[in-house]
């Protein structure tokens, strides 16, 4: 025979094709071996031009012999060489779907590989590459968007070989709340990490507002919208700079009387403060707090006590913000003047959280009467709100 | 309207016991803190007990610490004032005050008093 | 404790005469000073909170000034239903305590 080639080569398979001897023959006698593989032979009919080859081993180089035979004679042997295809990892699955994450799992091929290609698209055509090693068989996809159809796709790599493509389809879940409307809906939706975040005044996604929510205070899910911490920031500022906020969210900052009215104007909120000096620490929490818009001059109600620092915040119930430019306190002095800060003060304060940092006078300082009294500025404050039925909402999220 | 009514005040020997109640109305109870403060005979006002909205938190002067104890029912809208170990020096003109809004705040409103008289 | 001096501790004034009635307290207390008045057989009535606030329903004759340590009540013009014994009170800290009163009477 002559003219042996092979094709249709699969990871298992291939088909071998010659041209037959130009004398009539009884059969031809087929072998084929390859490294680590031994050789198997296979007599076939003089008619046949073809043959298949299954049972391979993948991502190996056999070589293939035929000869042709009749009676006793046999004709000289011609011989190829082939390749077969790397072949697949299998099962490919999507498992612990969340609205962002979900984590692949698969199996190796038989063949040993170099590494796989990742590749996952979703159907708006956004897609990722990644290549993993030779030892991973699950990889955890991250920064996936909620309420997605996603298509994963993994290939085995050996140097230049590559494998046929697998693939699985899976959905993201959707996110609770798209649009958190604070930092409890952020954590419902999965946001378990301290730090910025995007929430949406009542949901709009118009009414975008980048806010600081500690995950980790008490459950977590708070908005802050205080910061001491250092001085670096001048909390001695006008009604303008305090009805719109100020400084670096990350740091020290107010969020601003605007955004607090629209917070708690959203539902019913908690107050919490927690305190920091020298190694102790105190908080308190209100489980009913507002502010009311600026017709009411930022009217505070706090309401509810428990903690450890003390119930500083009572005498400020029900008092209008004070700035040294606009006094609603209710002292013939103006409060935020001689105090260098601005509150809810009455006359004046036994909370001034925006105080001087750092000063030990009398009342100047970032003062917290029931803890420190009103010589003693504490080193580190935050005041934080959220729902007062997250414990609620926790739960439920937790039983679905 | 707003209204405080003292009762249980009486002649009671030395080192006896007794409990003063007052009766709270027209106002929401559990929002406020309350206080007892105290007239001897012909005297100026001292204080005598403070206790929070809850209950939760009770303050004492010094002249009675360790003997009066303060307390409150919310359901009942009752705020109470047991006395023991009573001495000569306690007898006084015992009234009930309520608080502008804090612990520590002006007295806004006040009952008519009851008097307690300590003597053998 | 905070100590609360009052003084004069008597004062007789005719009707219609001006009336000031001084409070010093023993450390600063911001503006948490609270001004009462006694009637013979009678609680007490809030007339003054946070040093300068009137009560509600109390006439404006009744005013109160100062800050720190040093307090004022004054009566701008004595009526005869004025006459009664004013006490004024610290709620700054526990223990609250009172000034031992000045008694405004009829000269």
């Known amino acids: 025979p002559s003219g042996l080639v092979t094709a249709n080569i699969t990871d298992s398979e291939a088909l071998a094709r010659w041209q037959p001897a130009i004398a009539t023959v009884d059969s031809y006698v087929i072998s084929y071996t390859g490294e680590k593989v031994p050789e198997i032979t296979r007599t076939v009919s003089g008619n046949t031009v073809e043959y298949a080859l299954t049972d391979l081993e993948p991502a190996t180089e056999y070589t293939l012999r035929i000869f042709a035979e009749k009676g006793p004679q046999k004709s000289s042997t011609i011989t190829a060489k082939f390749t077969t295809d790397l072949d697949s990892p299998r099962d490919l699955t999507a498992t612990e779907v969340q609205s962002e994450t979900a984590l692949l799992t698969w199996r190796p091929p038989r063949a040993s590989v170099t590494g796989y290609l990742l590749v996952y698209e979703s159907v708006d055509g956004t897609v990722k590459e990644v290549i993993v090693g030779p030892d991973t068989t699950s990889y955890s996809l991250a920064d996936l968007s909620p309420s997605t159809h996603y298509t994963a796709k993994i290939q085995a790599l050996n140097g230049p070989l590559r494998s046929n493509m697998i693939q699985t389809i899976f959905t993201t879940i959707g996110l609770l709340y798209p649009f958190p409307k604070d930092c409890s809906q952020a954590m419902l939706n999965g946001d378990t990490t301290s730090g910025l975040y995007t929430i949406y005044l009542n949901g709009d996604k118009a009414e975008a507002l980048e806010v600081f929510c500690d995950m980790t205070s008490d459950g977590g899910g708070w908005i802050v919208f205080l910061r001491r911490k250092n001085g670096r920031e001048n909390f001695y500022q006008n009604w303008k700079a305090y009805a719109a906020g100020f400084g670096d969210r990350r740091e020290e900052f107010w969020l601003g009387l605007d955004n607090l009215n629209k917070i708690t104007a959203q539902g019913q909120y908690e107050l919490r403060v927690d305190l920091r000096d020298h190694g102790e620490t105190a908080f308190a929490v209100y489980d009913k707090f507002s502010v009311g818009d600026a017709k009411t001059r930022y009217k505070l109600k706090v309401e509810g006590y428990s903690g450890t620092a003390g119930d500083s915040m009572a005498y400020h119930n029900g008092r209008s913000f004070s700035t040294f430019d606009k006094d609603t306190d209710s002292a013939i002095t103006n409060c935020a003047l001689s105090y260098k800060g601005a509150f809810w003060y009455r006359n004046c304060h036994r909370v001034n959280l925006m105080g001087r940092y750092g000063d030990n006078n009398h009342s100047q300082g970032v003062n917290w009467f029931h803890w420190k009294g009103h010589e003693h500025s504490i080193q580190f404050a935050e005041m934080k709100l959220r729902p007062s039925n997250f414990r609620n909402l926790e739960g439920r999220r937790k039983r679905a | 309207q707003v209204q405080l009514v003292e009762s249980g005040g009486g002649l009671v020997q030395p080192g006896r016991s007794l409990r003063l109640s007052c009766a709270a109305s027209?106002?929401?109870?559990?929002?406020?803190?309350m206080h007892w403060v105290r007239q001897a005979p012909g005297k100026g006002l001292e204080w005598v007990s403070g206790?929070?909205?809850?209950?939760?938190?009770?303050y004492y002067a010094d002249s009675v610490k360790g003997r009066f104890t303060i307390s409150r029912d919310n359901a009942k809208n009752s705020l109470y004032l047991q006395m023991n170990s009573l001495r000569a020096e306690d007898t006084a003109l015992y009234y009930c005050?309520?608080?502008?809004?804090?612990?520590?705040?002006?007295?806004?409103?006040w009952g008519q008093g009851t008097m307690v008289t300590v003597s053998s | 404790d905070i100590q609360m001096t009052q003084s004069p501790a008597s004062l007789p004034t005719p009707v219609g005469d001006r009336v000031t009635i001084t409070c010093r307290a023993s450390?600063?207390?911001?503006?948490?000073l609270n001004w009462y008045q006694q009637k013979p057989g009678k609680a007490p009535k809030l007339l003054i909170y946070?040093?300068?606030n009137l009560e509600t329903g109390v006439p404006s004759r009744f005013s109160g000034s100062g800050s720190g340590t040093d307090f004022t009540l004054t009566i701008s013009s004595l009526q005869p239903e004025d006459f009664a014994t004013y006490y004024c009170?610290?709620?700054?800290?526990?223990?609250?305590?009172f000034g031992q009163g000045t008694k405004v009477d009829i000269k």
């Open positions: 027209g106002f929401t109870f559990d929002d406020y803190a």
């Open positions: 005050a309520k608080v502008m809004s804090s612990m520590e705040d002006a007295f806004d409103i």
């Open positions: 009170q610290q709620s700054y800290s526990t223990p609250q305590t």
């Open positions: 450390q600063y207390i911001q503006g948490f």
């Open positions: 946070d040093a300068s």
């Open positions: 206790i929070s909205g809850s209950g939760g938190s009770t």
